[in-house]
Every structure is written in structure tokens, then in C-alpha cells.
Interface confidence: medium
């Protein structure tokens, strides 16, 4: 058993049929010595008396809010949550496996630049009685500060018969150094509580590996005289790190016909313009990637050829 | 050329070669997303690797103030990786394919380090850890880790030289 926060405790249980469970001793937080009784949740059934209560925790029916009273007055509470371990593996019932970029990916994180700011998100099908708390640091043995906000519900989607809920959180490294080569990864820890079930999820990454620039901005076409060619121009996204002479991007320009089956013409360039042939009903798209480190490409920015 | 006395390097040449290094490092080990190497215990390699840190002066302001700080650190790293790529970690079994980019990568690391420090000048270099994995599978894992780390190092070096070429070239 360990303390998650004030008056909230997590009991770690090996979860299999007829498991013996864990013996837990609760102590009433009071100077009083006698006349103390214990109850669980809203039940008025007295579970025991005295300053301490010893219980055998085996299943969710044994978890909940234990309260000690004296003469009708509440003295203190202890909320017991369960963390299940099945076949040596902690349960992951609350969050959905996103399976990208690999199996058992519950948390996904992205950064728009090297400023030390990043966003993580996760999915669940659970809609109520759900709380999350997020902690983060750079490194684990000598952790350096990362400040995370509160996790918020950021999207709801219908998947078949199920509703899926996306939660996200924004974090900022306290003393970010965008020009440094990271040697210690960022660690993100999410505590998830659904009713009386506790689970924790972790992710470890370097900012450089989760970089995904915003799409290029101000994408414009300029037809060239007496030619089917056009000059495409664009600018670095506002959210990208500066100066651009240091944090450089590379770009992919694509000409795509109306039909997905049509051959795509692609040009790669480090410049912020390119000359391409504009076919009728086609569209021109541009995306960006860090020039020197192969992290994710941005989403496409597009304009029609016409 | 960046000699220890403090003259400027050939920024544009360094920029071109460092960008080539980035391309080679990624072609030598492209499948980064499919293997989380940090799960395999990094202590022996990455702890000894000369990372470019916040206080090494490789940020734009640091380069403007005194590029020698940063150039010396980059030089140290280039020598370190050049020695690792020439060690039995890469020359031993399992043998690299004849057309493997590792050979080119090795030569380019040496080329850039010589651009930064001509013969006869000496900056201190970092001790190379004695890593001699016994099993071929250990060697393979170590190669991946070294290349992964090299990708991060040359990315910072390439940014430095690109910025230098754009803003500090005579």
C-alpha cells in the first residue's frame, strides 16, 4: 500500500481467482483513543472499533472510502483504490491502446518546436467517474523540472457503437535549452483513476523524436508566363523555432490530381519556393520536416491549381 | 578553418559536409521508430558519448559570442564517433554490407573533423570507452544505439554550421 495523495491510498493486488489479497491497517487521524468506530462508503454498518482497523483487501468490494467516527462526528477518511496485477503485468483497462507507432502505446506526445513545450494525449471509452493527474520530468535519477497543466477532455468521437474520449495535457520544460543535444529523455507519468481502480501509464521520449512542425503557411501560386508551370511559395509556420538559419526545415511539394489513383509528382527542397507543373483540377500541397533530424512530417498545406 | 587559436572555420564547407553527415546517419539506420533502444539499458554507451549541452555555446548567441567553444565540442564528438565507427563494433561480425553507408559516414566524420582542425593543431579529445561486446547480437544492438546517438549529435552540428554559414561567414 502507498499514498497517492493526502488520504488516498493505492493497494497493489495480485489478481487471480482465490488470491489471498493484502492485509491493510488503517489508522484514524485523531488524538482520540476510545469510542472510535469505522464504516465503509455510505453504509452505516460498523466494520470495527478502535483507533486502527485491520482489513483484508481482495476485491473492489473491499475498496472505497473508510471513515472513522466518534459520537456521530467524522474524524478522518481514507480512500482505498486497487491497482491490479495480472500474470505479473499491471492492468491497462482504463486507456485504449493506440497501436501507433507500436503496440501498447497508450500515451502519444508531439511538440511543434524545440522550446520544451509538448502535448500528450490518450483515449478512453469511459465517460464518467474518471480522473487523471500528470507528472513529468527530464530524466529519472536526477530529475529536472517539467511543468504540466491539468488534463482536459479535448475531443469526443463515435467509433462504431462506442464513444471514444480523447484527453490531452500540455507540458513545458522549466529550463528548456533548444540548441542542446538531449541526453536524458523526458518522462511522462499519467495516474488514471476510474471509480476505485487505479492505473498508471508512462512514456519516455526525446523532444527531437516527437517533433511535428505545423504546416507551412501562406501557400501561394504564381503562374509563369507562357508556361504550364507555376511558382509555389510558402513560409515557415509561426510556431517553428527561431532563428530559421539555425532551426531549418526541409519541404516536400506534391502535385495531386483529383483522383487518388493519379500519379503524384513530388519535389523535395530546402527553399521556400519551387516551380511545378500545375495540371487541371489538381492541387498543390506542401509539408515540412526538420532539415537535419528525421522526425515527423507536418500535415499538408494545400491550394487548388485553378 | 577553426584552429584552436580562434580563426573562423570554412562555414559553408562545414555546412555542406555536416548536412551530408545527417543524410548518411539516417540512411545507415533508418528504422528508428521500430525499436525503442532506450529499453535496452544505455549505461555503457550513451553515458560516455560527448553530448552537445546547453553550456557548450552551440546556440546562436553563443556562436556569435565565441564560436570556438562550440567548435571544440563538435570536434571532440566527431573524433569520438569516428573512432567508434572504426572500432570492432562496426568492423566485427555480423559484417556490414559492402555498400553500407557506414563506411561513407566514417570517412565524412573524419573529413569534417579535419576541416575543423588542420594537422599540427591539437584540441583535447575525449577518451573512447572500451566497448567490446562478445556476442554478435550485442554488437548489432550497440551499432543501433551509436547510430541513434550520432543522428542527434550531427543534427545539432548541422544546425551550428548552417547558422554559421548564414550569419558568421566573412
Amino acid at each position: 500500500i502507498w499514498e497517492l495523495k493526502k488520504d488516498v491510498y493505492v493497494v497493489e493486488l495480485d489478481w487471480y481467482p482465490d488470491a489471498p489479497g493484502e492485509m491493510v491497517v488503517l489508522t484514524c487521524d485523531t488524538p482520540e483513543e476510545d469510542g472510535i468506530t469505522w464504516t465503509l462508503d455510505q453504509s452505516s454498518e460498523v466494520l470495527g472499533s478502535g483507533k486502527t482497523l485491520t482489513i483484508q483487501v481482495k476485491e473492489f468490494g473491499d475498496a472505497g472510502q473508510y471513515t472513522c467516527h466518534k459520537g456521530g462526528e467524522v474524524l478522518s477518511h481514507s480512500l482505498l483504490l486497487l491497482h491490479k496485477k495480472e500474470d505479473g503485468i499491471w492492468s491497462t483497462d482504463i486507456l485504449k491502446d493506440q497501436k501507433e507507432p507500436k503496440n501498447k502505446t497508450f500515451l502519444r506526445c508531439e511538440a511543434k518546436n524545440y522550446s520544451g513545450r509538448f502535448t500528450c494525449w490518450w483515449l478512453t471509452t469511459i465517460s464518467t467517474d474518471l480522473t487523471f493527474s500528470v507528472k513529468s520530468s527530464r530524466g529519472s535519477s536526477d530529475p529536472q523540472g517539467v511543468t504540466c497543466g491539468a488534463a482536459t477532455l479535448s475531443a469526443e468521437r463515435v467509433r462504431g457503437d462506442n464513444k471514444e474520449y480523447e484527453y490531452s495535457v500540455e507540458c513545458q520544460e522549466d529550463s528548456a535549452c533548444p540548441a542542446a543535444e538531449e541526453s536524458l529523455p523526458i518522462e511522462v507519468m499519467v495516474d488514471a483513476v476510474h471509480k476505485l481502480k487505479y492505473e498508471n501509464y508512462t512514456s519516455s521520449f526525446f523532444i527531437r523524436d516527437i517533433i511535428k512542425p505545423d504546416p507551412p503557411k501562406n501557400l501561394q501560386l504564381k503562374p509563369l508566363k507562357n508556361s504550364r508551370q507555376v511558382e509555389v511559395s510558402w513560409e515557415y509556420p509561426d510556431t517553428w523555432s527561431t532563428p530559421h538559419s539555425y532551426f531549418s526545415l526541409t519541404f516536400c511539394v506534391q502535385v495531386q490530381g483529383k483522383s487518388k489513383r493519379e500519379k503524384k509528382d513530388r519535389v523535395f527542397t530546402d527553399k521556400t519556393s519551387a516551380t511545378v507543373i500545375c495540371r487541371k483540377n489538381a492541387s498543390i500541397s506542401v509539408r515540412a520536416q526538420d532539415r537535419y533530424y528525421s522526425s515527423s512530417w507536418s500535415e499538408w498545406a494545400s491550394v487548388p491549381c485553378s | 578553418r577553426a584552429v584552436p587559436g580562434g580563426s573562423s572555420p570554412a562555414w559553408t564547407q562545414c555546412q555542406q559536409l555536416s548536412q551530408k553527415l545527417c543524410t548518411l546517419a539516417w540512411s545507415a539506420h533508418p528504422l528508428v521508430g521500430h525499436m525503442d533502444l532506450r529499453e535496452e539499458g544505455d549505461e555503457e554507451t550513451t553515458n560516455d558519448v560527448p553530448h552537445i549541452q546547453c553550456g557548450d555555446g552551440c546556440d546562436p548567441q553563443g556562436l556569435r559570442d565565441n564560436s570556438q567553444f562550440c567548435l571544440q565540442r563538435i570536434h571532440q564528438g566527431l573524433i569520438f564517433y569516428e573512432k567508434l565507427l572504426g572500432s570492432d563494433i562496426f568492423t566485427g561480425e555480423p559484417s556490414l554490407l559492402p555498400d553500407s553507408p557506414v563506411g561513407q559516414l566514417h570517412a565524412s566524420l573524419l573529413g569534417l573533423s579535419q576541416l575543423l582542425q588542420p594537422e599540427g593543431h591539437h584540441w583535447e579529445t575525449q577518451q573512447i570507452p572500451s566497448l567490446s561486446p562478445s556476442q554478435p547480437w550485442q554488437r548489432l544492438l550497440l551499432r543501433f544505439k551509436i547510430l541513434r546517438s550520432l543522428q542527434a549529435f550531427v543534427a545539432v552540428a548541422a544546425r551550428v554550421f548552417a547558422h554559421g554559414a548564414a550569419t558568421l561567414s566573412p
Epitope: S175, A176, P243, F247 | G55, G57, P60, Q61, D65, Q72
Partner: antibody
Framework: EVQLLESGGGLVQPGGSLRLSCAAS????????MMWVRQAPGKGLEWVSY????????VYADSVKGRFTISRDNSKNTLYLQMNSLRAEDTAMYYC???????????????????WGQGTMVTVSS | QSALTQPPSVSVSPGQTASITCSGR??????ASWYQQKPGQSPVLVIY???KRPSGIPERFSGSKSGNTATLTIRETQPMDEADYYC?????????FGGGTKLTVL
Amino acid sequence: EVQLLESGGGLVQPGGSLRLSCAASGFTFSRYMMMWVRQAPGKGLEWVSYISSSGGSTVYADSVKGRFTISRDNSKNTLYLQMNSLRAEDTAMYYCARIRLYYDSSGYWPRAFDIWGQGTMVTVSS
Amino acid sequence: QSALTQPPSVSVSPGQTASITCSGRKLGDKYASWYQQKPGQSPVLVIYQDDKRPSGIPERFSGSKSGNTATLTIRETQPMDEADYYCQAWASSSVTFGGGTKLTVL
């Protein structure tokens, strides 16, 4: 708690040597540039030398060049200043300071000395 | 090594605003920092990057820069603000400090 603690000062004759130490605690020492600053009695601050986080690069004020050597041992979280050929004008309180790099969205990251030690007094006199 | 010039002393009545200037050739191209040093104590960073305040420094302290002159302003000056104040800038790879200004709260 983030702290710098200097030691090694004292009375020394002209031409003599001293080695100052600065023990760092409460932060990841190996990530920061460090520097020595001195202050003669009743006078202003004068920078002496600074060193990169890895220890590979150093810069000195003209007044101490060739006589003083700055170094660091990241495994011991300690900064050093070896002072040789000491002169009367080197008499001062010697402070070590951490050089913090502040990230600025313009991309130009200013430095400042955000943590200072309590200082150690060096007196050069016959 | 370019010098930074500060007035040797500035006097102010409690509750009033004190301003200390620092001027130097090409200071406009550089960032200025300001340090406070009380008698018998180590310097403390009060302003960096011309106008940024580190955490723990009261809001009464502010910095600004116009051309080649940086200014440290202390609003509602208190007796505890009595100290020497130094401006500082980086000049290429060397560091420059101003001569210091003694602030007296009358």
C-alpha cells in the same frame, strides 16, 4: 537547494600560487557554463574566466591570461581556479557563478549569472 | 573590451522611484543584466535580457533599454533596496561589468 560554495582562499606571497574550489549542489552541474568573478576591496566586479559545460573550452580576462587556469570536474560537481604568479593586484574576494542560458523565442539566448557563491578571500601580500 | 558607464551614486527617498542608467558603445546590440549587491553579501541577479525579472525578485524592479543605454528602475523604493547595483553585458567572448552605482535610500 541550489548552492555554490567556494574554498581555498587565504594569504599568499607575491609570486605564489593558490587553488580555489567551488562545490556545486542542488542542480545538474554538468549542464551549465561556470565562471569566476572577483571584487577587490571597495571596488566593483571584474570577470576572471569562464568554462564550457563539458570543460573543453575556456576564456580568460586579459589581466589573468597565462597565469590563471580554470577547470572543472563534472563527476565531483566542482569548479576550480588555479592561480599562479600571484600579484598584489589579484587581492580580492573571488566568487564562482553559474551561467544560465535563458531561452528566448527570438532564438538569441541571453546569458546571466543566476547563482553566486558566498566568495572566498584571496590576499596577496609580503 | 568596451566599458559600461554607470553613475557612481543615486539617492532616493523611501517610496519614490529610483533609476540607474548604464551606457556603453554598442550596448544596443547586446542584452544587459543587472545585479544587486548588499554590503558583505554576494551579488544577486535582479534583471536579465534587458527587462526580464528572475523568479523571487519583486515586481518593483524593472529594466528597459533605449539605444545604447540600459536603465534599472526601482519603484516604491524601500530601505532594504539600499545596495550597489552593477550592469553587465557580454562583449563578444568577454564579459563587461559597469563600475557600479551605490543606491542610497535617504
